[in-house]
């Protein structure tokens, strides 16, 4: 059975063509009766997102060398595993290179769903608190305060995929008084449009304002952990919630002050040190893997205050998923 | 919200080039493929190629080899085709189209060349 | 090259009415089949991925079978806003080639 997989020739990492490796050979696999189901285990497999599509491998380019052997006739998954070694498979008795599987999971870096590209939070600790900036014909602009609302920070808020608007008639302190062009003011919005550049406003640049006027808004940033798979909300997979998406945490330097910081944000007790076999009964998770060597002192009140790599980097797989057994 | 605008209506003479630009917005550029699809007036449509955005490389179809050019600019999150040697029967509405390697999902709204003496 | 065969050219139909368009591939394609929708003077939309995936936001009275040489377009009950060009494309292998298309109008 195959010892590697990886996904070659797509845009990124968690797409391409199928290649095994095999006693230090890597090959390609026949797509017959390939099918979504397949592609969910080796998404989950590379750490990659959901499943997207089973695109002809034969599409990616450079295509497979000519003495690149095809290694797999068939892949049967039922969706449940966590790896391609894990389904029945066949070997090969007739096929070539025209028929070689291909793979497509969610892009972790990007999709299709719109990117905040026309307003910022600047100045701010991250990107959900800050003073307001908006961009208009490749020019970032400051927003003044005169006719500013909730209404306005809450689409604000909504835009950028942070969580509720908690300050939203702020001034700037001094140190973060803007320095570009002020935008706009008399900004009127109903608090249900999609973008602020959807709200009625005065005219662009024509305005009396200066620049001890320009607004600060602050969201939540909307962090949340979860333990997942347990018996119980304070026992199983350790989930964290970023940018609206739910995802794994790597088990890269994670440890007992690690173990109690989770815990104690989630009210359930002290952390009861599972073993290493315990910690593993609540299988791999699916999708993003956000969080990779988290340190923490054990002082913290929230995973969020630890250290750790940028949110989504790592080099992990869902092998090495952390959990949580708390004293509830 | 997610988008592809193109360059507008060209008109051109017979043996000279024609370079047709494709912004996008609203979705990261470089996760999807970058495909360029014609349609001659009254006629169906015509793959011509795609671009990885991400690396830069193309895959045309072989009709158009040699005489296609897929190139695109991160920075501005657009993508460009150049068609060279043009004959009256290049005159159609080529269309961007983003998407996945094997499908469009997002299309530009189209641009007219017209190639004519 | 993989040559895509529609049919019919076009067809009549009226509100409410199931209609069915086919398409035929010149070798197999297994499921790499998509459906597309155009208007006129507008760009095509994709409806249909994977011979049977719908795709997103497009409405469930539209649906894809098929697998091999032979696949089905279907619209349910057809409605005002359907009537437009139907084409298929393969996405086996490159060059990617479309079907000549089907015009449904009104009856």
């Known amino acids: 059975s195959p010892s590697g997989v990886r996904l070659v020739g797509g845009l990124h990492r968690c797409e391409g063509r199928v290649e095994v490796e095999q006693k230090g050979q890597w090959g390609t696999v026949c797509d017959d009766g390939w099918d979504i189901k397949d592609v969910a285990v080796l998404c989950r497999e590379l750490g990659c997102g959901a499943a997207s599509g089973t695109p002809s491998g034969i599409l990616y380019e450079p295509p497979a060398e000519k003495e690149q052997k095809v290694l797999i006739q068939s892949v049967s998954c039922t969706g449940t595993e966590d790896t391609l070694a894990q389904c029945e498979q066949e070997e090969v008795y007739d096929c070539s290179h025209d028929e070689d599987a291909g793979a497509s999971c969610e892009n972790p870096e990007s999709s299709f769903s719109p990117v905040p590209e026309g307003v910022r939070l600047a100045d701010g600790p991250g990107h959900c608190k800050g003073r307001v900036e908006v961009k208009h014909q490749n020019q970032w602009y400051t927003v003044c305060q005169t006719g500013w609302s909730l209404r306005a920070a809450k689409v604000v808020c909504r835009q950028l995929g942070c969580g509720r608007a908690v300050l939203t008639q702020k001034r700037c302190n001094k140190h973060a008084y803007g320095r570009k062009p002020i935008w706009l003011s008399q900004m009127s919005c109903s608090g249900r449009e999609a973008t602020l550049q959807d709200c009625p406003s005065g005219p662009w640049g024509k305005n009396t304002c200066n620049h001890d006027e320009d607004t600060w808004v602050e969201c939540e940033d909307p962090f949340d952990l979860r333990l997942v798979g347990g018996d119980n909300l304070c026992s199983g997979r350790l989930e964290v919630l970023h940018k609206g998406v739910w995802g794994s945490v790597c088990d890269d330097n994670w440890g007992e002050k690690e173990d109690q910081v989770v815990c104690k944000q989630l009210g359930c007790g002290k952390s009861l040190s599972p073993s290493f076999r315990d910690r593993k009964c609540y299988g791999p998770g699916v999708g993003r893997i956000w969080l990779d060597n988290v340190r923490c002192s054990g002082e913290e009140q929230s995973l969020e205050q630890c250290q750790h790599r940028f949110w989504g980097f790592h080099d992990c797989t869902h092998q090495e998923d952390v959990a949580v057994i708390c004293s509830g | 919200e997610v988008q592809l605008v193109q360059s507008g209506a060209e008109v051109k003479k017979p043996g000279a080039s024609v370079k047709v630009s494709c912004k996008a917005s609203g979705y990261t550029f470089t996760g999807y493929y970058m495909h360029w699809v014609r349609q001659a007036p009254g006629q169906g449509l015509e793959w011509m190629g795609w671009?990885?955005?991400?690396?830069?490389?193309?895959n045309y179809a072989q009709k158009f080899q040699g005489r296609v050019t897929m190139t695109r600019d991160t920075s501005i999150s657009t993508a460009y085709m150049e068609l060279s040697r043009l004959r009256s029967d290049d005159t159609a509405v080529y269309y961007c189209?983003?998407?996945?390697?094997?499908?469009?999902?997002?299309w530009g709204q189209g641009t007219t060349v017209s190639v004519s003496s | 090259d993989i040559q895509m065969t529609q049919s019919p050219s076009s067809l009549s139909a009226s509100v409410g009415d199931r209609v069915t368009i086919t398409c035929r591939a010149s070798?197999?394609?297994?499921?790499?089949l998509n459906w597309y929708q155009q208007k006129p003077g507008k760009a095509p939309k994709l409806l249909i991925y994977?011979?049977?995936s719908l795709q997103s936001g497009v409405p469930s009275r539209f649906s894809g079978s098929g697998s091999g040489t032979d696949f089905t377009l279907t619209i349910s009950s057809l409605q005002p806003e359907d009537f437009a060009t139907y084409y298929c494309?393969?996405?086996?292998?490159?060059?990617?080639?479309f079907g000549g298309g089907t015009k449904v109008d009104i009856k």
């Open positions: 994977a011979a049977s």
């Open positions: 070798q197999s394609i297994s499921s790499y």
């Open positions: 494309q393969q996405s086996y292998s490159t060059p990617l080639t």
């Open positions: 189209a983003g998407g996945r390697i094997d499908a469009f999902d997002i």
């Open positions: 671009i990885n955005p991400n690396s830069g490389g193309t």
